[in-house]
Amino acid sequence: VSPTFQVVNSIAPVQECSTQLDIVIVLDGSNSIYPWDSVTAFLNDLLERMDIGPKQTQVGIVQYGENVTHEFNLNKYSSTEEVLVAAKKIVQRGGRQTMTALGIDTARKEAFTEARGARRGVKKVMVIVTDGESHDNHRLKKVIQDCEDENIQRFSIAILGSYNRGNLSTEKFVEEIKSIASEPTEKHFFNVSDELALVTIVKALGERIFALEA
């Protein structure tokens, strides 16, 4: 503000600072995820908080189980509304195996490429959602190191539903999913009791993602 109380420069509100991010969500779509509606509800709540556009935040989604599918690329949609519609239509692809390392590696190698809409100089964020220990966990060390080398920030979410339903120990699973998260782990790792509880972490997850850019 000038001495004559004229506005000479306007400052964007804080939430507007956090717009330049390329976010790829890596979803476990293996058979044990149930109900799938909880996953799409989680996506809906998370995505509607985002300012999506070619000059703002971009979102891509990868789904994995035994194999990996690009549901949509970072540059596929140019508004939050379009992404919300597309996310609602994502169907669970299933699979008897949970190849988490492959899902993450495919996201790194393919989803975060310029051909699929990644922008040079824009911070890369990966959100990994899974409900069980991976069959390819012996490949995770390399995959995570590769992500580190490319400065990909990783948020990991462990869904404990199938463990709780089967009265199984979650210790090894939680340890694995924590190892996926960027450091400090406590700011990048979440766990929820079951699929329905995914929506309860949306606010905190959203805040932490956008704190990266701020």
């Epitope: 190849m99 390819d136 060390k141 590769d146």
Partner: antibody
Framework: QVQLQESGPGLVKPSQTLSLTCTVS??????????WSWIRQHPGKGLEWIGY???????YYNPSLKSRVTISVDTSKNQFSLKLSSVTAADTAVYYC?????????WGQGTTVTVSS | EIVLTQSPGTLSLSPGERATLSCRAS???????LVWYQQKPGQAPRLLLY???SRATGIPDRFSGSGSGTDFTLTISRLEPEDFAVYYC?????????FGGGTKVEIK
């Protein structure tokens, strides 16, 4: 260009421990994009994965050998090693070290180890 | 563990002919985790293909791979004299990493 070279005794007595070292040249073992593997091949037979190690020291072993195998890494020497305890004649084989990224793309030339008294 | 069965055990062909080698898995293998090697007598194996169908550095384009799930194929379009060797498939998606028993391609 990365090269691997196995070294160690070619003859080991039954019940003793087989010890081999793989020296990596032309690149750093600490570069985190690879696992460092040991594979063996019995005379006239196929290939068997023994295990591998990440530069940080995390190890992964073939369950069929796990109780007898130790793989370690020495980043200061750019080497990784294999120890196989309580050997028998069935452990006579060519032992290879290899670099594993997306498949094993660099191999040592292999060293023959005979278990005999 | 995943068992990989290669067939045939031996393939007798002449230079210039097409070789088709099969690798069958006991359970589904992601194609991203399926590789092929070539091994000549007295030598270490050499990586030919990764991701089931991507050629490794320096591998000629007469080598190609295909397949998914439990059935994978290595094809050598026109056999050169240096191609007579043993070929192994390997999966590394599940631990333990496992190799097929090999297919020997010999001169007819």
């Amino acid at each position: 260009q990365v090269q691997l070279q196995e070294s160690g005794p070619g003859l080991v007595k039954p019940s003793q421990t087989l010890s081999l070292t793989c020296t990596v040249s032309g690149g750093s073992i600490s570069r985190g994009n690879y696992y460092w593997s040991w594979i063996r091949q019995h005379p006239g037979k196929g290939l068997e994965w023994i295990g591998y190690i990440f530069y940080s020291g995390s190890t992964y072993y073939n369950p069929s050998l796990k109780s007898r195998v130790t793989i370690s890494v020495d980043t200061s020497k750019n080497q990784f090693s294999l120890k196989l305890s309580s050997v028998t004649a069935a452990d006579t084989a060519v032992y290879y070290c290899a670099r594993d990224g997306y498949g094993m793309d660099v191999w040592g030339q292999g060293t023959t180890v005979t278990v005999s008294s | 563990e995943i068992v990989l069965t290669q067939s045939p055990g031996t393939l007798s062909l002449s230079p210039g002919e097409r070789a088709t080698l099969s690798c069958r898995a006991s359970q589904s293998v992601s194609s991203s985790y399926l590789v092929w090697y070539q091994q000549k007598p007295g030598q270490a194996p050499r990586l030919l293909l990764y991701d089931a169908s991507s050629r490794a550095t320096g591998i000629p384009d007469r080598f190609s791979g295909s397949g998914s799930g439990t059935d994978f194929t290595l094809t050598i379009s026109r056999l050169e004299p240096e191609d007579f060797a043993v070929y192994y498939c390997q999966q590394y998606g599940n631990s333990p990493l496992t190799f097929g028993g090999g297919t020997k391609v010999e001169i007819k």
